[in-house]
Interface confidence: low
Amino acid sequence: QNLFTKDVTVIEGEVATISCQVNKSDDSVIQLLNPNRQTIYFRDFRPLKDSRFQLLNFSSSELKVSLTNVSISDEGRYFCQLYTDPPQESYTTITVLVPPRNLMIDIQKDTAVEGEEIEVNCTAMASKPATTIRWFKGNTELKGKSEVEEWSDMYTVTSQLMLKVHKEDDGVPVICQVEHPAVTGNLQTQRYLEVQYKPQVHIQMTYPLQGLTREGDALELTCEAIGKPQPVMVTWVRVDDEMPQHAVLSGPNLFINNLNKTDNGTYRCEASNIVGKAHSDYMLYVYDPPTTIPPPTTTTTTTTTTTTTILTIITDSRAGEEGSIRAVDH
């Protein structure tokens, strides 16, 4: 046997090179046949009228042919025949890789509510061989469950991901990434999660700046409520009492001018959206008017939570004066 061939792997749409090589040549006819045993080339003569076949080289020791725009229907055994006595035949197998035609991601719900489990599906259509699908939420890899469907030598892979969403997932991409021998680099598609969550309420004292409230001073509190959808209603109430007559409510802001000891109490900002409602409390303690001693430096910290009560105690240097409990978020 002095007729040799090599197997070829090619990506659909690209060029395959088929070579029939003869070791000891005696100018015998070399012929190349397709899988249907139709002649593609007889020496440098092409009886097959498929212009995708082009002669790259013809000599007594080689017949080299290129097949452009390869399709899956070109896959199979190509026979080289050498017309010696007796005739020799050798075959080369063309394997065609087909990248997925389409990569589709489908989220069960456009908008999810925090704590909910949603189903995300990714389909890589009509590839050969079957595609491997990987899932990422942001930079974190997740585990999906894949199903492979075969049709006419092509594979459609569907991967299912069950995902429990949290408010931190809002705006985070869910990425379906494909791994396939015909794909170089990253082939991926993504959808951004939209997660609805109940408001987080936080009270900010915008006046006085040093955080110490004294008789005769003004107080300004701003209620910050963040949720999805954005809360439409932000309301101020005084817990267990009427709002002072001289209190002014303006949207998320509460103004109390000319503070006096009767204003002491808990002021609550309430916010709600379609997911739920939440509130944050501010405990006002009005101090005596200042003496000539300059006020101490004070710090205010507020933390929002729905389960833990955080008390921030602000004190000054005068003995016997009570601490002021400032803000509690719920």
Partner: antibody, heavy 124, light 106 residues
């Protein structure tokens, strides 16, 4: 000088088959691709298929696929065209036509040499 | 299949005229086009192959041009022997002929 000589006229009944021959002389038979082209009365030319005699591999026009068989006998340098399931529309002059390899510049079935034609009449 | 459309179907001209016949392919066939002349009761005769190459023995008044989908056959100065039917033929994908153009004496 290459010559293609065809068999004589035929009269056939609808549903039957006809086999026309074409003998090549004046050259090496293996140098040819032999095609069959037909021409109905007053009509244009229609390529039916072709064969490379040395290998016996044939290609057919889609219209005739399954109804036409083209073969070659290398020992007698003769090509044959058999058309089955004849109907009246198959009444035509059938030409064999040869195209000769021009080395690497040969790219398809165009025809430098033609036979004299064979009239096939399909009639009840 | 590739369809070949010739125009005109019939052309009347006089000796000495310059004549052009057009052939259009339904898809690109590169330059794989041949032109034939056929006289009544005779087999066709190859004039041009590969769109513009003149077959040996064919008079130089015949010329071909074009590529892709548009092709023309030109006879620079008609001779009495040129009145016949002309066919274009693509051989990019097997073979298909045009429907023919009959060149008549005006």
């Amino acid at each position: 000088q290459v010559q293609l000589v065809q068999s004589g006229a035929e009269v056939k009944k609808p549903g039957s088959s006809v086999k026309v021959s074409c003998r090549a002389s004046g050259g090496t038979f293996s140098s040819y691709a032999i095609s069959w082209v037909r021409q109905a009365p007053g009509q244009g030319l229609e390529w039916m298929g072709g064969i490379i005699p040395i290998f016996g591999t044939a290609n057919y026009a889609q219209k005739f696929q399954g109804r036409v068989t083209i073969t070659a006998d290398k020992s007698t340098s003769t090509a044959y065209m058999e058309l089955s399931s004849l109907r009246s529309e198959d009444t035509a002059v059938y030409y064999c036509a040869g195209d000769i390899s021009r080395g690497s510049s040969w790219y398809g079935y165009y025809f430098d040499y033609w036979g004299q034609g064979t009239l096939v009449t399909v009639s009840r | 299949d590739i369809q070949m459309t010739q125009s005109p179907s019939t052309l009347a001209a006089s000796v000495g005229d310059r004549v052009t016949i057009t052939c259009r392919a339904s898809q690109s066939i590169s330059s794989w086009l041949a032109w034939y002349q056929q006289k009544p009761g005779k087999a066709p005769k190859l004039l041009i192959y590969k769109a513009s190459s003149l077959e040996s023995g064919v008079p130089s008044r015949f010329s071909g041009s074009g590529s892709g989908t548009e092709f023309t056959l030109t006879i620079s100065s008609l001779q009495p022997d040129d009145f016949a039917t002309y066919y274009c033929q693509q051989y990019n994908s097997y073979s298909t002929f045009g429907q023919g153009t009959k060149l008549e004496i005006k």
